[in-house]
Interface confidence: low
């Protein structure tokens, strides 16, 4: 006997579905209706079979049932999803009280149609996307945004196929405080400039760019200045950073910036042109082979330097003598 594709825990909190069977029993998902957190994986299959069934579907007739769901967090993954199906799901979720939506390992085919005026989508606070490809390239964010109420606080996009957003088609994200573009190693500073559409992220406080192909702190500074964003905290850890190239223009960092993470950045010296004043600066786990001089560092309340060779004489010796 094949195992049930969906499993719900004893307290009806979390329900996980893995539809890996060639003829999956989709009705198994009905046991998830009581759950707060639902994870559905499609086994890499195409959901095109639902297109015909969905043609006449009207989520409004199920509005009361959808409103009564305990569902707060939903993950959908491992499938090829026609854009019309995605639109229908977002329409239906607009009647629910969903707060967090995660899409991962998806291929969205076709263009997401715009919603009708009277049907707002879900009032999400968090949207996460990982390894999602879109037929419409960088236009995907604008297409998705049309379906979301302006409540989004956290947007995390990893392993994206395109982050070059057509800025003219985007509305502002008035509540967005966290933008995480980590794990996009092909992004780079030029890509960051394209992704940070001016005046679209007025409330941004946290910007995470771990493993995002960043090259110099001053290049990131220039991208932030060009977009006019004012993050309080910036995470550039896990990038291979260079000290600013000679002749680079001086850049004025956002005045609000108080915390900068440059850990695991392969830095051999403290980069030039850091913000003059910070509350927190993390330079841990780099390749600094001498203690930074006070004039190299900004005025900082909380400085972390652990894990650099100069603090470990043995590691420094290995670095200087590669045969050791």
């Amino acid at each position: 006997a094949t195992p049930e594709p969906c499993q719900i825990d004893d307290e009806d909190v979390r329900c996980v579905c893995n539809f890996t069977h060639p003829q999956p029993d989709w009705s198994s998902a009905l046991q998830c209706v009581a759950a707060v957190e639902v994870e559905i994986r499609g086994g890499g299959r195409s959901l095109e079979e639902f297109l015909l069934k969905s043609a006449s579907a009207n989520p409004k007739q199920y509005a009361d049932m959808l409103k009564a769901l305990r569902l707060r967090r939903l993950t959908v993954g491992a499938a090829r999803v026609p854009a019309q199906i995605l639109a229908l799901v977002l329409h239906a979720l607009g009647f629910s009280r969903l707060k967090e939506l995660t899409l991962e390992d998806l291929e969205v085919t076709g263009q997401v149609p715009p919603p009708l005026q009277e049907t707002p989508g879900p009032a999400l606070t968090t949207l996460r996307l990982r390894n999602v490809s879109w037929a419409t390239g960088g236009a995907w964010l604008g297409e998705l945004q049309q379906w979301l109420q302006p409540s989004l606080k956290v947007l995390k996009v990893a392993q994206a196929s395109s982050l070059a957003f057509p800025c003219a088609q985007l509305r502002a994200f008035p509540a967005l405080t966290t933008l995480d573009l980590s794990d996009n190693p092909g992004l780079g500073e030029r890509g960051l400039t394209a992704a940070l559409c001016p005046r679209k992220f007025p409330a941004l406080e946290d910007l995470a760019l771990r493993n995002a192909g960043m090259e110099t702190p001053s290049g990131v500074c220039a991208a932030l200045a060009g977009a006019g964003v004012q993050p309080h905290r910036l995470d550039l850890s896990h990038n291979s950073l260079r000290a600013t190239a000679a002749g680079a223009r001086e850049c004025v960092w956002p005045a609000a910036l108080s915390s900068l993470n440059l850990s695991f950045a392969e830095l051999e010296q403290v980069p030039k042109g850091l913000p003059p004043k910070l509350t927190v600066l993390d330079l841990s786990c780099n390749k600094l082979n001498r203690a930074p001089r006070p004039e190299e560092l900004p005025a900082v309340d909380d400085l972390t330097l652990e894990g650099n060779p100069y603090m470990d004489p043995e590691a420094l010796q290995h670095q200087e003598d590669p045969m050791a």
């Epitope: 707060k99 606080k153 966290t178 406080e205 946290d206």
Partner: antibody
Framework: QVRLQQPGAELVRPGASVKLSCKAS????????MNWVKQRPEDGLEWIGR????????HYNQNFKDKAILTVDKSSSTAYMQLSSLTYEDSAVYYC??????????????WGQGTTLTVSS | DIVMTQSQKFMSTSVGDRVSVTCKAS??????VAWYQQKPGQSPKALIQ???YRCSGVPDRFTGSGSGTDFTLTISNVQSEDLADYFC????????FGGGTKLELK
């Protein structure tokens, strides 16, 4: 840096109520669930419940649903826990702790220093 | 409720030793397990999350392993500052903690 500030101690009479506070700073208060944990030497650590400061959604441990009420004041970035009908068994250290932001629940990445509650006549 | 059992309440060790603290969940919790260290008069501090990922700033002598129902925290080359209480925690369904294991000197 992230800080969760709690008063060091509270002394209350049996049968009374108390409202413990936890002031958050150094991060966006409304982005992370705030949890409360009870610790007594004989019982170890017990999770009481959590609150989403964004919209005050709460989840409680069933053992505390008639004992604790969690609230927040977004304007001051402060979380509160009110404990009612206090008995000697409520004497403990109470910690507020921030839930790291992963989706299916998450570990607690920052903890307050704890408030020692003593119930005594 | 999911019960997290730390069968050893006390463990004796010496500086430089390798020690393993174990924790068993009463039902499947995937890798949704964290380990915390608590020293007298202090708050717990997260060491390991998602069963095997070291938290920021935690020395690499601390390693976590396991999935499903059986989990282990291993401290290699124990230092005197590692003498403390260690708690496991599951966060697969709400939150429950183990009863703790006190690491003390032989």
């Amino acid at each position: 840096q992230v800080r969760l500030q709690q008063p060091g101690a509270e002394l209350v009479r049996p049968g009374a109520s108390v409202k413990l506070s936890c002031k958050a700073s150094g991060y966006t208060f409304t982005t992370y669930w705030m949890n409360w944990v009870k610790q007594r030497p004989e019982d170890g650590l017990e999770w009481i419940g959590r609150i989403d400061p964004y919209d005050s959604e709460t989840h409680y441990n069933q053992n505390f649903k008639d004992k604790a009420i969690l609230t927040v004041d977004k304007s001051s970035s402060t979380a509160y826990m009110q404990l009612s009908s206090l008995t000697y068994e409520d004497s403990a250290v109470y910690y507020c702790t921030r839930k790291e932001g992963r989706q299916w629940g998450a570990y607690f990445d920052y903890w307050g220093q704890g408030t020692t509650l003593t119930v005594s006549s | 409720d999911i019960v997290m059992t730390q069968s050893q309440k006390f463990m004796s060790t010496s500086v430089g030793d390798r020690v393993s603290v174990t924790c068993k969940a009463s039902q499947y919790v995937g890798t949704n397990v964290a380990w915390y260290q608590q020293k007298p008069g202090q708050s717990p501090k997260a060491l390991i999350q998602s069963a095997s990922y070291r938290c920021s700033g935690v020395p690499d002598r601390f390693t976590g392993s396991g999935s499903g129902t059986d989990f282990t925290l291993t401290i290699s080359n124990v230092q005197s500052e590692d003498l403390a209480d260690y708690f496991c925690q599951q966060y697969n369904t709400y939150v429950t903690f183990g009863g703790g294991t006190k690491l003390e000197l032989k």
